[in-house]
Each structure stands twice: as structure tokens, then as C-alpha cells.
């Protein structure tokens, strides 16, 4: 049997339903067979854990997310083998496999592969600072969010009205969702906002910086 | 050699029923998936019913559900087609037709006629 | 349902010529695609399956090509027994339709 599903991966906001297309062509006899499974993020194909069976004309739902398992079409003896996953949960993300079977079609192994990802908004971040709050010294500001898929890209502001920070004295990374601050002055004193945003959304935190005086020690 | 000859073609009123059959040899019967195709008066050939090999799954096109219904014998290596609320136009020639393994027609019988008219 | 559109109509050769005739299809069938040659008052025989695939018996100058919603059949070298009715047939999702078929004649 020849499966056919999309090249390209699927991707399904949180608590939406997610369609997996699985289509083929045989000639249906009384031994065909359907079983789709479900392989998690970055597990080897082995690994795979049953999700639903057709078989005798029967089809069974089986496992953690069998009271959200359908199928669009059933029986899915029409050439039509398409999943339907209700209330997709961060942990649906990963590799489904579109397995049918109807001896004594041997033509491929009639085995098709979907790569799901759910999309998740960004949590509210957390924000943090390490480093010397001195003048003169540096400092980096990190922000995380725990949820986020795909993973959130990272964008810290300054807040109010403050002088043109020299070039360099501000450099930040949007993947790490980290800003270094070097050369700090007292003008560098203030509130700094992270926005950890993605497709689904964005989130923010918010952390002041006090710079002070050498001598001084450094509040946060 | 394959063969398949059909029967039951007959001149029926509209709203009349009429069972078709298909008598096979040649081959495992009751290994192939079997369908039933027409072809209209003015030659356009529509596929009207297939049944799995040993008659688990039938399927129809829109046009026939709910009137038509498939059904076999493998002991007797004999396919039938079961009509009913027929409609002028089902007026057709019906061929009984063997599948490949994939949904193809590799092998045809000769056909027999219905007619639907009052 | 999967539309088959068929052309030309009709077609006129003569013996040792060839034809080309084409199938379009309303969606992607990949090269799930069949054709078949009825000749008057016969029932219909396959000439090719899976869009280039030619069963046993079925002389080499027939040839298909074609995948997604483009197919052809080419008969190379016109014989007098090749005149008659040709029909496309998608082989991939229930409902399985055939095109309005495409008639050669002798000219």
C-alpha cells in the first residue's frame, strides 16, 4: 500500500483540533488494517506508542489520548485514513505515523510520517539580573519563559524617557533572551521590560536596574 | 482463462427493483475485490459498487446509496448487485469488473442491460 | 468527488499515425491514474495502471504518462484494432470516476 501525507509539518494552536491527512490507494480487503501511532520529540521511530487500531471493522482507540482520537472518515476503507486529534495539549507535539496494511498489497511499506508541533503562547517570562550594578562595571539581564512553542524569540526595552545608551554599551540576544549591559553609568538606572513573543502571542516581565556609585552596593 | 458473465438485466418500471448477477471463474474469487461499473446511453461508464474480497466492506457513490447494495458468494464464485427505487437513470449497461490490486478494473464481464422505463 | 476531464472529444487518424490524448483531474492523484480501450459493443479492457504502468498483453506502443491532475496516453503507430473509445479512471479515494472517455476514429 502507497500512503500519502503532507511534506510539510503541521501545526495546531493549544486546545484546537489537529487534522493529520493520511491518504492511499488500494484494492480494501477484509485484512486491511489502520493503526496510527505516536513517537514524542527527538525519540527514535522504534519508540512508538499505538494511538488507534482499525481492524475487522473495528476501530479502537488505545492509549493516554484515545478519548481524544477519531478518525474523519470511518471506516477508513475509502482511501481515507485522516486522524483527528480534539484539544491538542503541549505533549501531542512530535511524530505520528499513518501505518496501513491490506495483504496482499506489498507494493511500499504503507507507512507515512506527520510532524505535529502545538503551538503554545509564551508563559510570563521571568526576569533576572547577575553581574556588577556598579558605574563602570557590567551586567547581563536574562529572561525566560518555560512555555512557548515555537520557542519565543526575546526583546528587551528600556522604559521612559533616558540619553541614547552608547553603541555597544547594550547588546542583546534574542534566542538566549539575554542583554549585557557594559560600561555602566548611573544614567543606566531604570526599568527594563523583556517581551518573549512567538505566533500565539507574547508575554512580558519587568525588572529596575540601580546602578550606584563604586563604593556603593547594588540593590536590585 | 478469466471470465465473468453477468444476468438479471431486465426492463423494469421506475420505482421497480431488480438483482443483478455476476457468475466468475478463472480465478481465486474469494481473494479480489469485485465492483460493479454501468455504463449510461450516452457511454459515460460510472463505478456503482465495490465489496472486499470476502465481503467485510462495501462501498457506493452518492448516486446509488441507500438503493443499490453489493454482496457475493465465494462458495458459489458469484457477485450480485441488489436494486431498488430504481430511477431512469440507472438505464445502463452493468458490467461486472474484477479489481487490481489497487482500484483498477483489470477484468470485465460482457455486461447486461437494464432499463429503466414506465 | 474527483472530477475527470477528458480530451479531445473525438479524434480522427490514420493507420501508422500517433495520437496523444490527455486526462486532467480536479485534484492531485499523484499517478493513480488507469486507462482503458473499449472497442464498439465490447466491454472496456486496461491499458495502463498507475498513471505508466502497461498489464501484461498490452502491445509496447501504448505508452502513459503523467502525474498529478496531468496524464496522456500516447499510441504510437496507429493499428487498425487500436480504433475505438478511451476512458481515464482515478484509482485513489472513493468515489473512483472515469472521464467522458475520448472516441478515435479512422479518418
Known amino acids: 500500500v502507497e500512503v500519502k501525507v503532507p511534506t510539510e509539518p503541521l501545526s495546531t494552536p493549544l486546545g484546537k483540533t489537529a487534522e493529520l491527512t493520511c491518504t492511499y490507494s488500494t484494492s480494501v480487503g477484509d485484512s486491511f488494517a489502520l493503526e496510527w501511532s505516536f513517537v514524542q520529540p527527538g525519540k527514535p521511530i522504534s519508540e512508538s506508542h499505538p494511538i488507534l487500531y482499525f481492524t475487522n471493522g473495528h476501530l479502537y482507540p488505545t492509549g493516554s489520548k484515545s478519548k481524544r482520537v477519531s478518525l474523519l472518515q470511518n471506516p477508513p476503507t475509502v482511501g481515507v485514513a485522516t486522524l483527528k486529534l480534539t484539544d491538542v495539549h503541549p505533549s501531542d507535539t512530535g511524530t505520528y505515523l499513518c501505518q496501513v496494511n491490506n495483504p496482499p498489497d506489498f507494493y511500499t511499506n504503507g507507512l507515512g510520517l506527520i510532524n505535529l508541533t502545538v503551538l503554545v503562547p509564551p508563559s510570563n517570562p521571568l526576569c533576572s539580573q547577575s553581574g556588577q550594578t556598579s558605574v563602570g562595571g557590567s551586567t547581563a539581564l536574562r529572561c525566560s519563559s518555560s512555555e512557548g512553542a515555537p520557542k519565543p524569540v526575546y526583546n528587551w526595552v528600556r522604559l521612559g524617557t533616558f540619553p541614547t545608551p552608547s553603541p555597544g554599551s547594550m547588546v542583546q540576544d534574542e534566542v538566549s533572551g539575554q542583554l549585557i549591559l557594559t560600561n555602566l553609568s548611573l544614567t543606566s538606572s531604570g526599568t527594563y521590560r523583556c517581551v518573549a513573543t512567538n505566533q500565539m502571542g507574547s508575554a512580558s516581565c519587568e525588572l529596575t536596574l540601580s546602578v550606584t556609585e563604586p563604593s556603593q552596593g547594588r540593590v536590585a | 482463462e478469466v471470465q465473468m458473465v453477468e444476468s438479471g438485466g431486465d426492463l423494469v418500471k421506475p420505482g421497480g427493483s431488480l438483482k443483478l448477477s455476476c457468475a466468475a471463474s478463472g480465478f481465486t474469487f474469494s481473494n479480489s475485490g469485485m465492483s460493479w461499473v454501468r455504463q449510461t446511453p450516452d457511454k459515460r461508464l460510472e463505478w456503482v459498487a465495490s465489496?472486499?474480497?470476502?465481503?467485510?466492506?462495501?462501498h457506493y457513490p452518492d448516486s446509488v446509496k441507500g438503493r443499490f447494495t453489493i454482496s457475493r458468494d465465494n462458495g458459489k464464485s458469484t457477485l450480485y448487485l441488489q436494486m431498488s427505487s430504481l430511477r431512469s437513470e440507472d438505464t445502463a449497461i452493468y458490467y461486472c469488473?474484477?479489481?487490481?490490486?489497487?482500484?483498477?478494473?483489470?477484468?470485465w464481464g460482457q455486461g447486461t442491460t437494464l432499463t429503466v422505463s414506465s | 468527488d474527483i472530477q475527470m476531464t477528458q480530451s479531445p472529444a473525438s479524434l480522427s487518424a490514420s493507420v501508422g499515425e500517433t495520437v496523444t490524448m490527455t486526462c486532467r483531474a480536479s485534484?492531485?492523484?499523484?499517478?493513480?491514474l488507469a486507462w482503458y480501450q473499449q472497442k464498439q459493443g465490447k466491454s472496456p479492457q486496461l491499458l495502463v495502471f498507475n498513471a505508466e504502468t502497461l498489464p501484461e498483453g498490452v502491445p509496447s506502443r501504448f505508452s502513459g504518462t503523467g502525474s498529478g491532475t496531468h496524464f496522456s496516453l500516447r499510441i504510437n503507430s496507429l493499428q487498425p484494432e487500436d480504433f475505438g473509445s478511451y476512458y481515464c479512471q482515478h484509482h485513489y479515494v472513493i468515489p473512483w470516476t472515469f472521464g467522458g472517455g475520448t472516441k478515435l476514429e479512422i479518418k
Open positions: 485534484e492531485n492523484l499523484y499517478s493513480y
Open positions: 469488473a474484477r479489481q487490481g490490486v489497487r482500484p483498477f478494473f483489470d477484468y
Open positions: 465489496i472486499s474480497d470476502g465481503g467485510l466492506y462495501t
